[in-house]
Every structure is written in C-alpha cells, then in structure tokens.
C-alpha cells in the first residue's frame, strides 16, 4: 500500500481467483484514543472500533472511503483504491490502446517546436467518475523539472455504438534550450482513477522524436504565363522554432482531386515556393517536416486550384 | 558564445555541402546498423545516450545562433579554447566566436573519427563479419574535416591488446552512431545558419 495523495491510498493486488489479497491497517488521524468507530462509504454499518482498523482487501467491495468517527463526529477519512496486477502485468482497463506507432500505446505526445512545450493525449470510453493527474520530468534518476497543467476533456467522438473521449494535457520543460541535444528522455506519468480503480500509464520520449510542425501558413497561387503550371508559395508556421535558417523545414507540395485514388502531382522542396501543374477541381496542399531530423510531417495546408 | 549574424558572404560557405553529406552518411549507416543488428539493442529507445564529446567540446553552446543567446537555458556553457584558423571561414570579418564554433565541430569530427576507426578495426576481426563501418561515412567525415582545415594535434588511434568483445563493440557502435547522428544534425543546422547569414 502507498499514498497517492493526502488521505488517498493505493492497494496493489495480485488479481486471480481466490487470491489472498492484502492486509491493510488503517489509522485514525486523531489524538483521541477511545470511542472510535469505523464505517465504509455511505454505509452506517460499524466495521470495527479503536484507533486502528485491520482489513483484508481482496476485491473492489473492500475498497472505498473508510471513515473514523467519535460520537457522530467525523475524525478522518482514508480512501482506498485498487491497482490490479494480472499475470504480473498491471491492468490497463481505463485507457484505450491507440496502437500507433506501436501496440500498447496509451499516451501519445507531440511538440510543435523545440521550445520544450508538448501536448499529450489519451482516449477512454469512460464518461464519469474519472480523474487524471499528470507528472513529468526530464530523466528519472536525477529528474529535471517539467510543469504540466491539468488534464482536460479535449474531444468527444462517436465510434460505432461507443462514445470515445479524448483527454489532453500541456506540459512545459522548465528550462529548455531549443538548440540543445537531448541525452535524457522526457518521462510522462499519468495517474488514472475510475471509481475505485487506480492505473498508471507512462511514456518516455525525446522532444526531437515527437516534433510535428503546424501546417505552413499563407498559401498563395500565382499562375505562370502561357503555361499550365502554377507557382505556389507559403511561409513557415508561426509556432515553428526560430531562427528558421537554423531550424529549417522541408516541404511536400501535392496537387490532388477530392479522392486519394485520383492522379496527382507531387514535389518536395526546401524552399518556400514550388511550381506544380494545377487541374480543375483539384487542390494544392503543402506540408512541412524538420529538414534535418525526420520526425512527423505536419497536417496539410490546402488551397483550391481554381 | 554565439554566432554573429553578418558573417560569410552568401553561397561562399563550402562546408554546407559537406555537412549535408555527413548527415546523410551517418543516417544511412545508422539505418544499416539497425537492420543488420536487429537482435541487438540498437534503437533509440533501447540504447544509453552517451556523448563522447561531453566536457571536451562545446559545439551546441559555441555555435548558438545569435537569436538564442537571450535564452538563459542555452547559456550554461563550458568554456573551451580552440585554434582559430580554417578554410570554411569565408570572410576576413569572421569573428572569434565563429572560429570557436567551427573548431569545436572539427574537434567533434576528430574524436568520432578516432572512435569509428578503432571500432572498425575491431569489427574486422569479428569471425561473423556481421557489420563494418561504411567507408563512405569515414570519407565524408574526412572531407568535412579538410574543408574546416584546422591545424590540430593528431589523436593516436586507440589500440587494444585484449580480445575484443564483439557483442559490446556492436552495442557501442549503435550508441556512437545515435550520438553522432544527433551531432550531425546540429552541425547541419549550424552550417545552414551560417550559409544564410
């Protein structure tokens, strides 16, 4: 058993049929010695008396808010949560496996630049009685500070019969140099509590590996005289690291109709303009990627050909 | 501790081309190592990230773009003194700081060159003959060093009398290649910045 936060404790249980469970001793936080009784949750049934209460925690029915009272007055609370371990593996029931970039990916993180700011998100089908707490650091043995905000519900989607909820959190490394060469990864730890179930999820990454620039901005078309070719120009996204001559991007320019199966024109360039062939009912799209370290491409920025 | 904005004339920066070749060569070599050593811990997640130049050179700090010198977090540098001549310095107005930056890059290359050559000598003794260093990568390191053209004491190639542990050597190769790729990215960014200045 360990303390998650003040008056909240996590009991780690091997989860299998007829498991013996864990013996837990609760102590009432009071100077009083006599006349103390214990109850669980909203029940008025007295579970025991005395300053300590010993319980055998085997299942979710044994978890919950234990309260010690004296003469009708509440003295203190202890909330017990369960963390299940099945076949030596901690349960991952609360969050959905996003399977990208690999299986057992519960947390996904992205950074728009090298400033040390990043966003992580996760998915769940659970809609109520759900809380998340996020901690992060650079390295684990001698951790350096990363400050994370509160996790918030950022999107709701309908997937078949199910509703899916996306939560996200923003974090900022306390003292980040955009030009630094990372040798210790960022560690992100998410504590998830659903009713009386506790789970924790972790992700470890270098900022350089989770870079995904914003799409290029200010796309403009200039038809070339006596030609079917069009000069398309754009600018670096505002959120990208500066100076741009140091943090350079490379671009992919594509002309395509509405369907992905349609024919297309495609060209790659390090410049902020390119010449392509425009077709009726097609769109010109441009996306960006770090020129020197190939992490993710940005989303497309698009303008219609006409 | 920073690069001035008005340095070489545009297009007069001969090291840019070499630094692009360097990044390409080390990336190819790393990809080859990952594929060939698929049953060894050779991915970014699996290896320890070591920097053989740590406390010996200060490339990131010495080559910091002027715009980043206002960032307190970028200025915790170790001072290192270097020789200040070199053919990539395309203008007489080149500042001492730029010379410091380029000589720091030169020292990095020299250290990695020695490590890679020593390692290749060991890998050539491996009866499995599983992996060797790409001669192209070693040649590209050499070309960039020549373009930088700093006078510097030659570092003797480390020789070892004991039997090499080939497993450890291959793990170390992965560690070195990952670190060298990150440094090659920095070098490419620096050269691009100087070329644009």
């Amino acid at each position: 058993i360990w303390e998650l936060k003040k008056d909240v404790y996590v009991v780690e249980l091997d989860w299998y049929p007829d498991a013996p469970g864990e013996m837990v001793v609760l102590t009432c936080d009071t100077p009083e010695e006599d006349g103390i009784t214990w109850t669980l949750d909203q029940s008025s049934e007295v579970l025991g008396s005395g300053k300590t209460l010993t319980i055998q925690v085997k299942e979710f029915g044994d978890a919950g808010q234990y309260t010690c009272h004296k003469g009708g007055e509440v003295l203190s609370h202890s909330l017990l949560l369960l963390h299940k371990k099945e076949d030596g593996i901690w349960s991952t029931d609360i969050l959905k496996d996003q399977k990208e970039p690999k299986n057992k990916t519960f947390l996904r993180c992205e950074a728009k630049n090298y400033s040390g700011r990043f966003t992580c998100w996760w998915l769940t089908t659970i809609s109520t009685d759900l809380t998340f707490s996020v901690k992060s650091s650079r390295g684990s043995s001698d951790p350096q500070g990363v400050t994370c905000g509160a996790a918030t519900l950022s999107a709701e989607r309908v997937r078949g019969d199910n509703k899916e909820y996306e939560y996200s959190v923003e974090c900022q490394e306390d003292s980040a140099c955009p030009a630094a060469e990372e040798s210790l990864p960022i560690e992100v730890m998410v504590d998830a509590v659903h009713k009386l179930k506790y789970e924790n999820y972790t992700s470890s990454f270098f900022i350089r590996d989770i870079i995904k620039p914003d799409p290029p901005k200010n796309l403009q078309l200039k038809p070339l005289k006596n030609s079917r070719q069009v000069e398309v120009s754009w600018e670096y996204p505002d959120t990208w690291s500066t100076p741009h001559s140091y943090f350079s991007l490379t671009f992919c320019v594509q002309v395509q109709g509405k369907s992905k199966r349609e024919k297309k024109d495609r060209v790659f360039t390090d410049k902020t303009s390119a010449t392509v062939i425009c077709r009726k009912n097609a769109s010109i799209s441009v996306r960006a990627q770090d020129r020197y370290y190939s992490s993710s491409w940005s989303e497309w920025a698009s303008v219609p050909c006409s | 501790r920073n690069l001035p904005v008005a340095t070489p004339d545009p297009g007069m920066f001969p090291c840019l081309h070499h630094s692009q070749n360097l990044l390409r060569a080390v990336s190819n070599m790393l990809q080859k190592a990952r594929q060939t050593l698929e049953f060894y811990p050779c991915t970014s997640e699996e290896i320890d990230h070591e920097d053989i130049t740590k406390d010996k050179t200060s490339t990131v700090e010495a080559c910091l773009p002027l715009e980043l010198t206002k960032n307190e977090s970028c200025l915790n540098s170790r001072e290192t003194s270097f020789i200040t001549n070199g053919s990539c310095l395309a203008s007489r107005k080149t500042s001492f700081m730029m010379a410091l930056c380029l000589s720091s890059i030169y020292e990095d290359l020299k250290m990695y060159q020695v490590e890679f050559k020593t390692m290749n000598a060991k890998l050539l003794m491996d009866p499995k003959r599983q992996i060797f260093l790409d001669q192209n990568m070693l040649a590209v390191i050499d070309e960039l060093m020549q373009a930088l053209n700093f006078n510097s004491e030659t570092v003797p190639q480390k020789s070892s009398l004991e039997e090499p542990d080939f497993y450890k050597t291959k793990i170390k190769l992965c560690i070195l290649l990952h670190a060298f790729r990150i440094r090659a990215v920095t070098i490419d960014r620096v050269m691009s910045y100087l070329n644009a200045s």
Partner: antibody
Framework: QVQLVQSGAEVKKPGASVKVSCKAS????????LHWVRQAPGQGLEWMGW????????EYAPKFQGRVTMTTDTSTSTAYMELRSLRSDDTAVYYC???????????WGQGTMVTVSS | EIVMTQSPATLSVSPGERATLSCRAS??????LHWYQQKPGQAPRLLIY???QSISGIPARFSGSGSGTEFTLTISSLQSEDFAVYYC?????????FGGGTKVEIK
C-alpha cells in the same frame, strides 16, 4: 493489371511524320497521366512530354515543342504521339508510360522502334 | 534544364557483392529523384521513387538514399538478374531529365 500495348515498328523517310499508338488496359485511361519517353540505339532515356487524358492538357519538352503532338481517344483507351519533320537522329525506341503520379514512370509500354532513313 | 550525371558509366561487380551507383544533379532537387532498371531489349522498370521509397515487388536488396544534389542506389548483394543498366531521373522541374545510366556488369 495495368498494361500498355504499343503499335508496331515503323520505318520513315527524313521529313516525314510518324504516329505511334499506345492502348491501355486494366484501368480507365483518364485515371493516369501518360508520358512518352524515347531511347536512341545504345543511348539513354529522353523525356518527350506528357498528356492528361482527362482534359487533354499537355506539357512538352522544349526540344520537341512544335514538332510533337500528344493526343488520346478515351473511347478506345488509346494514346497517340505524333512526331513531325523526322530526322535521322529521331531513330529510337519510343515508349509510352502511365502513372497516377505526374513526374515519374511506373507502367511502361513495350516500346515502338521508329527508324528514320533515306 | 537540370543535368543529371551518373557515375561510374560501367561498374564491374561479382555476384554477391555490394554495388553502389551514384547520381548527381546540376542543382539541388531535394528528394525528387527516381531510379529505373533496364535489361537489354526490355522497357525500363521503376525501382525506387523519391530517392528512398521502395516499390512493392522490388527486392529489398535495392535501396536508395540522398537528397539535394547527390544520390545513391545500393544493391546490397548482387544477384545474376541484377546485371543491367540503371538510370536516375529528376522530377524537381520540367523538363524531366535522366542520367546517362550506369551499366552493372559481371566481374
């Protein structure tokens, strides 16, 4: 699968014209760009131009501008390349090729040998 | 127009050995570079597109790399069916242009 079948070999006199055909099967002609590339005996490859069968748009290499015409007949799924004012150095194998991407060549025809000789 | 230069013109390699073919562009073309294989009496066949993207059905021993002005096609272990002429082609701008080719022959 996508296939391109070209017309047979031709022998032409200098100053004459030649029209090579390229019949597409296994796909709808308008779904792909169509290029023509030639190869003189023992020489390398030379791009001549492309046509978008969907709208008839064309782009020719400057070297062939004014001397070449590329057309398509969607009803028969056939593309044509006509080269006029033939010279002896136009002796080559002429290939048609198709791709959903405009700038490289995925599916090639078997080639048509055109000999220009007096 | 962009001039593509391939080297060497002829490469003599023993079966099982590694072959490295080079292609250089007269100006920077990013990764707009494609590789083809041509055997005598046959039409060319696309091997690699956009410098390093492999084509399904093409053996994994063929790989491409490079960007800017310098590109490489590597055949990791030459098989008898790989002896042919290899062409690079740029698609950075029109007119599309090919290199002069590299003939890979048996040593």
């Amino acid at each position: 699968q996508v296939q391109l079948v070209q017309s047979g070999a031709e022998v032409k006199k200098p100053g004459a014209s030649v029209k090579v055909s390229c019949k597409a099967s296994g796909y709808t002609l308008t779904d792909y760009y169509l290029h023509w590339v030639r190869q003189a005996p023992g020489q390398g490859l030379e791009w001549m131009g492309w046509i978008d069968p969907e709208n008839g748009d064309t782009e020719y290499a400057p070297k062939f501008q004014g001397r070449v015409t590329m057309t398509t007949d969607t009803s028969t799924s056939t593309a044509y390349m006509e080269l006029r004012s033939l010279r002896s150095d136009d002796t080559a194998v002429y290939y048609c090729n198709a791709n959903k991407e405009l700038r490289y060549f995925d599916v090639w025809g078997q080639g048509t040998m055109v000999t220009v000789s007096s | 127009e962009i001039v593509m230069t391939q080297s060497p013109a002829t490469l003599s390699v023993s079966p099982g050995e590694r072959a490295t073919l080079s292609c250089r562009a007269s100006q920077s073309i990013s990764i707009n570079l494609h590789w083809y294989q041509q055997k005598p009496g046959q039409a060319p066949r696309l091997l690699i597109y956009f410098a390093r993207q492999s084509i399904s059905g093409i053996p994994a021993r063929f790989s491409g790399s490079g960007s800017g002005t310098e590109f490489t096609l590597t055949i990791s272990s030459l098989q008898s069916e790989d002896f042919a002429v290899y062409y690079c082609q740029q698609s950075n701008s029109f007119p599309l242009t090919f290199g002069g080719g590299t003939k890979v022959e048996i040593k």
